[in-house]
């Protein structure tokens, strides 16, 4: 009774289609699978960025897998063939591992790459990225930004750079159709007659870097002798009301400062009849129902009331 063996996949490789970090892992079937042609062979794939402590593990019947990686670091992957126990009348049989690596040969020293890269998706409408030139680079150095997300045929270059002293220090992006809730890949590379420039790679999701506009139309409404309702409207733009959190700052008679975080466009404040002045400002942020992270908006214009009319039912600016 001979021991059942299976070969590892052939030609295991990592392919870079030019999508700035979204890579293809692909392989060919092992040879000598005819003994198992009634049986579906599976593959166990493990991969990670070099330096990461944990492997991502996938079991698949396919001959390829796609995922995003940090191209600032190398990538390592390994794969073996699995014959399920149904194929072997007993325990699962595994081949030896086939291994491969991939990295982009770095040009230039690390200090030449862009510094302090910062990207903000203003009001879920306009993406703007800015950076500082690398340390010690000359004024002839220019940086170029390329981007890709699933849905684009190929990586695109920025067409509207922000410049300072003739150097590109930022990019205003065009309208990005169907670009949220998926990885957005950026590469900023550079050129200089003086020395090679190191490329930098960035990956994020646009909904996580949204900075909304501040709320508008702040109003007061007297609810009772000791309660005032503060109200405002969601900022203009595409962000739905269900996606907002708000932070309020309330000042009574120049002394008391109340801050609160709320999910709705109202806040009820306990007051006394002695209150002579009331001011509040609000800012907004995309909440956890619509993103994993976000940036607070600027504060709204201050809305104040002072004088005896505070006891009346509605106070408008």
């Amino acid at each position: 009774d001979t021991e059942i063996k299976v070969n590892p996949p052939q030609d295991f490789e990592i392919v870079d289609p030019g999508y700035l970090g979204y890579l293809y892992l692909q392989w060919q079937p092992p040879l000598s699978l005819d003994h198992f042609k009634e049986c579906t062979v599976e593959y166990e794939l493990k991969y990670r960025n070099i330096g990461s402590e944990t492997w991502k593990t996938i079991i698949t019947k396919n001959l390829h897998y796609k995922d995003g990686f940090d191209l600032n670091k190398g990538i390592e992957a390994k794969i073996h063939t699995l014959l399920p126990w149904q194929c072997t009348n007993g325990s699962e049989v595994q081949s030896s591992w086939a291994e491969t690596t991939y990295w982009i040969s770095p040009q230039g020293i690390p200090e030449t790459k862009v510094q302090d890269m910062d990207c903000v998706y203003y009001n879920w409408q306009y993406l703007l990225c800015s950076w500082k030139p690398g340390i010690g680079v000359l004024l002839d150095t220019n940086y170029n930004l390329f981007y890709w997300y699933e849905g684009l045929d190929h990586a695109l270059q920025c067409v509207d750079y922000i410049k300072a002293d003739g150097q590109n220090i930022g990019c205003r992006f065009p309208y990005l159709e169907a670009s949220d809730y998926k990885d957005f890949y950026i590469c900023v590379n550079g050129s200089s007659e003086n020395k090679p420039i190191r490329s930098s790679y960035f990956t994020f999701q646009l909904q996580n870097i949204v900075k909304p506009l501040p709320p508008v139309y702040l109003t007061f409404t007297r609810e009772s002798s000791c309660e005032i309702k503060l109200k405002w409207s969601i900022p203009l733009g595409p962000i739905p009301a269900r996606c907002f959190d708000y932070e309020i700052e309330i000042r009574e008679d120049d002394t008391t400062l109340v801050t609160a975080t709320v999910e709705n466009e109202t806040y009820t404040l306990k007051t006394t009849n002695e209150t002579r002045q009331l001011c509040f400002v609000v800012r907004s942020k995309v909440n956890i129902y619509c993103s994993d992270d976000g940036i607070w908006s600027e504060w709204s214009d201050k809305q104040c009331w002072e004088g005896e009319d505070l006891s009346k039912k509605t106070l408008l600016r």
């Epitope: 052939q10 030609d11 293809y24 699978l33 001959l63």
Partner: antibody, heavy 118, light 107 residues
Framework: QVQLVQSGAEVVKPGASVKVSCKAS????????MSWVRQAPGQGLEWVGT????????YYPESVKGRFTITRDTSTSTAYMELRSLRSDDTAVYYC???????????WGQGTLVTVSS | DIVMTQSPLSLPVTLGQPASISCKAS??????VAWYQQRPGQSPRALIY???YRYSGVPDRFSGSGSGTDFTLKISRVEAEDVGVFYC?????????FGQGTKLEIK
Amino acid sequence: QVQLVQSGAEVVKPGASVKVSCKASGFTFSSYGMSWVRQAPGQGLEWVGTISGGGSYTYYPESVKGRFTITRDTSTSTAYMELRSLRSDDTAVYYCARRDLRSAMDYWGQGTLVTVSS
Amino acid sequence: DIVMTQSPLSLPVTLGQPASISCKASQNVDINVAWYQQRPGQSPRALIYSASYRYSGVPDRFSGSGSGTDFTLKISRVEAEDVGVFYCQQYNAYPLTFGQGTKLEIK
């Protein structure tokens, strides 16, 4: 539909070099290996090399190893075979073919005649 | 290297009659065998992979069988467009090797 379009015929002198191209369309180029097969006048088929989908692996028979080099350019979906130090017995029609998932060759180009003659 | 030996090298067949081509490998190649047809003046065309599986678009009068070292290509009813040279090929190990070809002609 899958198409492989090869470059035109070449006439070269012994010892010279030539580069034959094969432009692919109708499929995801980087997902498939490409093989090259030659056919001398009136003779059968002879495999002369294979390159994997991503270009990481190349395979050649001993008869051409060191003289023939296969490369690929994903940006233009083109495979190339460079033939160096050519001899008269390298005269043949050179075919590119897509390697299917089993290393058989499922689609073939129209062929490029390379004539080595002094 | 694995040697693939085809027989017969020439096969005259009457239209509508069956035809059979044999291919023997010098060592075990499991089912890693393909068959190709080359019509006069044309590029080869893939017919069969993994010894017995037809490529899409290949008429079902073509069938392949075998494993290990012995393989057969059968044409159930030969048609005029089947004229040409048929090659077997093993891809079990590099270097990939072809049989020397079988020329099918109409009687």
